[in-house]
């Protein structure tokens, strides 16, 4: 009974450094508490971008200083990452854990490659 997690293969961040994607999981059980973590993989290094635990039917709440925001609807989480710059280009992996009730399930997506292009500075006007 593995849990499958789906996410888009590629997303292009906006010129304001904002990227959004959907993380969808096929729940093997009736979870009431879910944890979603976004991991960034670049050059074989893995770092946690953000994480949130939420109760099904409630809003997804990240920490105040998080660069992530999100909403949940059923087995679908809409994630937005802001403040991105070109150096943040990389593979962003959605990790979903069904925390409660037992049994626990882990699901890891294949990752979304987020491309970030820094905007060209506006040329000085004469």
């Amino acid at each position: 009974k593995a849990m499958h997690v789906a996410q888009p293969a590629v997303v292009l961040a906006s010129s304001r450094g904002i990227a959004s994607f959907v993380c969808e999981y096929a729940s093997p059980g009736k979870a009431t508490e879910v944890r979603v973590t976004v991991l960034r993989q670049a050059d074989s290094q893995v770092t946690e971008v953000c994480a949130a635990t939420y109760m099904m039917g409630n809003e997804l709440t990240f920490l105040d200083d998080s660069i992530c925001t999100g909403t949940s609807s059923g087995n679908q989480v809409n994630l937005t990452i802001q403040g991105l710059r070109a150096m943040d280009t990389g593979l962003y992996i959605c990790k979903v854990e069904l925390m409660y009730p037992p049994p626990y399930y882990l699901g890891i997506g294949n990752g979304t490659q987020i491309y970030v292009i820094d905007p060209e500075p506006c040329p000085d006007s004469d």
């Epitope: 593995a2 944890r35 946690e48 994480a51 409660y100 882990l106």
Partner: antibody, heavy 118, light 108 residues
Framework: QVQLVESGGGVVQPGRSLRLSCAAS????????MHWVRQAPGKGLEWVAV????????YYADSVKGRFTISRDNSKNTLYLQMNSLRAEDTAVYYC???????????WGQGTMVTVSS | EIVLTQSPGTLSLSPGERATLSCRAS???????LAWYQQKPGQAPRLLIY???SRATGIPDRFSGSGSGTDFTLTISRLEPEDFAVYYC?????????FGQGTKVEIK
């Protein structure tokens, strides 16, 4: 560097209690699920318990449910295992382990020996 | 509970030879959630492979993992003296977390 160090093992009589500790360093402790795994002399590995992140969710192996309690103090970067009503079959080396980013147990402590004998 | 059965129980080989260890699950395990560990006498286990085929940090490329569904394999392409140890497979996709009983790789 990333490290886990267990302590608190020893020899105890059946029915008595013991508390194990696991001090973590080198990583953001609160961002990881933490497990206890044990190994009886000459035997294989047996998962014992896990505690998640802020500590509100805990799971136990059937063999220890109702007798063992896992807890954590994120301010002290420390994991605990309170073992009550100990039995001879609880004799083992107890390891704490980190559930890594991908879920596998990527960091292990050196282990602490618990012997339950009269 | 997912039961993992490892075979053989003991593998007697010489340095330089190829070792093939098997792990069979009682029900399907997603390859994303199957790990292999190495344990030497008096030491803690060490993560070798996660996600069935991804090498953990610092693990030499002579170690490789493969498989899906219920059948998984750990291969050591050329045994080095330090590779003689006990190897465990583990599933971590759902609770309870379970290990195989281990395969001992010993010097022939």
């Amino acid at each position: 560097q990333v490290q886990l160090v267990e302590s608190g093992g020893g020899v105890v009589q059946p029915g008595r209690s013991l508390r194990l500790s696991c001090a973590a360093s080198g990583f953001t402790f609160s961002s990881y699920g933490m497990h206890w795994v044990r190994q009886a002399p000459g035997k294989g590995l047996e998962w014992v318990a896990v505690i998640w992140y802020e500590g509100s969710n805990k799971y136990y192996a059937d063999s220890v449910k109702g007798r063992f309690t896992i807890s954590r103090d994120n301010s002290k970067n420390t994991l605990y295992l309170q073992m009550n009503s100990l039995r001879a079959e609880d004799t083992a080396v107890y390891y704490c382990a980190r559930g890594g980013d991908w879920g596998a147990f990527d960091i292990w402590g050196q282990g602490t020996m618990v012997t339950v004998s009269s | 509970e997912i039961v993992l059965t490892q075979s053989p129980g003991t593998l007697s080989l010489s340095p330089g030879e190829r070792a093939t260890l098997s792990c069979r699950a009682s029900q399907s395990v997603s390859s994303s959630y199957l790990a292999w560990y190495q344990q030497k006498p008096g030491q803690a286990p060490r993560l070798l492979i996660y996600g069935a085929s991804s090498r953990a940090t610092g693990i030499p490329d002579r170690f490789s993992g493969s498989g899906s569904g219920t059948d998984f394999t750990l291969t050591i392409s050329r045994l080095e003296p330090e590779d003689f140890a006990v190897y465990y497979c583990q599933q971590y996709g759902s609770s309870p977390w379970t290990f195989g009983q281990g395969t001992k790789v010993e010097i022939k």
